[in-house]
Interface confidence: low
Amino acid sequence: KKVVLGKKGDTVELTCTASQKKSIQFHWKNSNQIKILGNQGSFLTKGPSKLNDRADSRRSLWDQGNFPLIIKNLKIEDSDTYICEVEDQKEEVQLLVFGLTANSDTHLLQGQSLTLTLESPPGSSPSVQCRSPRGKNIQGGKTLSVSQLELQDSGTWTCTVLQNQKKVEFKIDIVVLAFQKASSIVYKKEGEQVEFSFPLAFTVEKLTGSGELWWQAERASSSKSWITFDLKNKEVSVKRVTQDPKLQMGKKLPLHLTLPQALPQYAGSGNLTLALEAKTGKLHQEVNLVVMRATQLQKNLTCEVWGPTSPKLMLSLKLENKEAKVSKREKAVWVLNPEAGMWQCLLSDSGQVLLESNIKVLPTWSTPVQP
């Protein structure tokens, strides 16, 4: 018996061929011997089966001795043995219809679980293998689960259902809702304007929700909410903002925040959360601000950084075009009695300069000491 696999909602064509290459009488029946369709000369006739409005054939092929049964908009319950009677012969075809669906929604938050459920006809024992967009394979029977979805899981999942050594392929588009970056760091000199951007790693027609930026300043004992906002159809509106600092927010996506000036008291770490309508859970992105200040006070030239710096970062003070006078893995360096000229304060990581601040030291004219 020939086995054909079909997909729920698709169209399937079951073939039936006569040895005579001409139009002769044929009938398609189901396993209960109920007629589905057949011919009366050149006319298509239909029987009382449940497939009545979804069954068809190709009259153009009858003259070649081909009498296909076409079933549209397949349902799981269409799984059956179909019998083609032609030339005193009976051809049997077993049709097995499968459906594969994602649990609840195909738009899932990063870290959530994806469950794929296979609908299959009674008596079948299929296995399923799915390949994620990043090339990872998962196998299962009636259900497959993937926990802790990552950004790279966004895209088309290709799932293959195997039954009786036959295969049928499903494609399911999954969108993982996440920010493009889990974390970012901004380096600024004191007084400079700071731009924070929070691009999303997905696009959807309508995006509605609410968000908040909590900030833990390095100098502060506790964190505080800097801004809260609403998102309606990709339009951003600020609900509440602190007086210090007075953040500004862009009205369109990507989410964009401007801090008028970088000050040591603002250096620290923030966590932007975004709660999306009809989704349980929130999207998170961490953002860090490092602020540098170079100052000259009497005979002391000092360079300091505030904020979350890694222990391997190097802070240096050097006179322009000369070797570094002082270089330490610390958050403050200084030079006593600096020479006149343009001094540079550099924050670097393995030789790559992350932040630079220049300060001009003027010559000091000392008066001669009296004898």
Epitope: R134, D153, S154
Partner: antibody, heavy 118, light 107 residues
Amino acid sequence: EVQLQQSGPELVKPGDSVKMSCKASGYTFTDYFMDWVKQSHGKSLEWIGYIYPNNGGTNNNQKFKGKATLTVDKSSSTAYMELHSLTSEDSAVYYCARRGYDEGFAYWGQGTLVTVSS
Amino acid sequence: DILLTQSPAILSVSPGERVSFSCRASQIIGTSILWYQQRTNGSPRLLIKYASESISGIPSRFSGSGSGTDFTLSINSVESEDIADYYCQQSNTWPFTFGGGTKLEMK
């Protein structure tokens, strides 16, 4: 050893059709997709579509809808591609390539050169 | 359709050098990228699948990296037999698409 043997070069007139073949050996023909790829002279590669020999299911690149018809003959483990209403734009090398579920185009035929000229 | 942009168009190297080919996708595609080598008058040959997975029979000097939208194929010590065109291809969604290719030349 997996082998894909393609038919020889074709010189055809504009407006005509051409049917090329790709005979597979060294593996179970019905277990893998057979894809077809176009490469115009000095240009990159373009995916035309695939056929799944097990059930004859096809999926074509929209760009080649109506241009390419993919078929198979399971008894001879051969895949066919017929190109219709040929123009000079269709002059190219056409490759068949075997694709599994967890790999790219791991095996390629040697290519069939089609030249459309009056 | 997903557009794959390869750069540079031509790379000139000396034997023994390390070389890297870049491929950028127009949208996030996870690690669904494959790399092929095509020598003059030859058929393409699969080098790397799913961005970084090696293919049996391919020399270990070929490696791949990247995810999301930016991908790299590297040859850590170029040999004369590596002179060829190199193509990336995405298998994330239909239609499958190829990059425009990078030609590797010897100085």
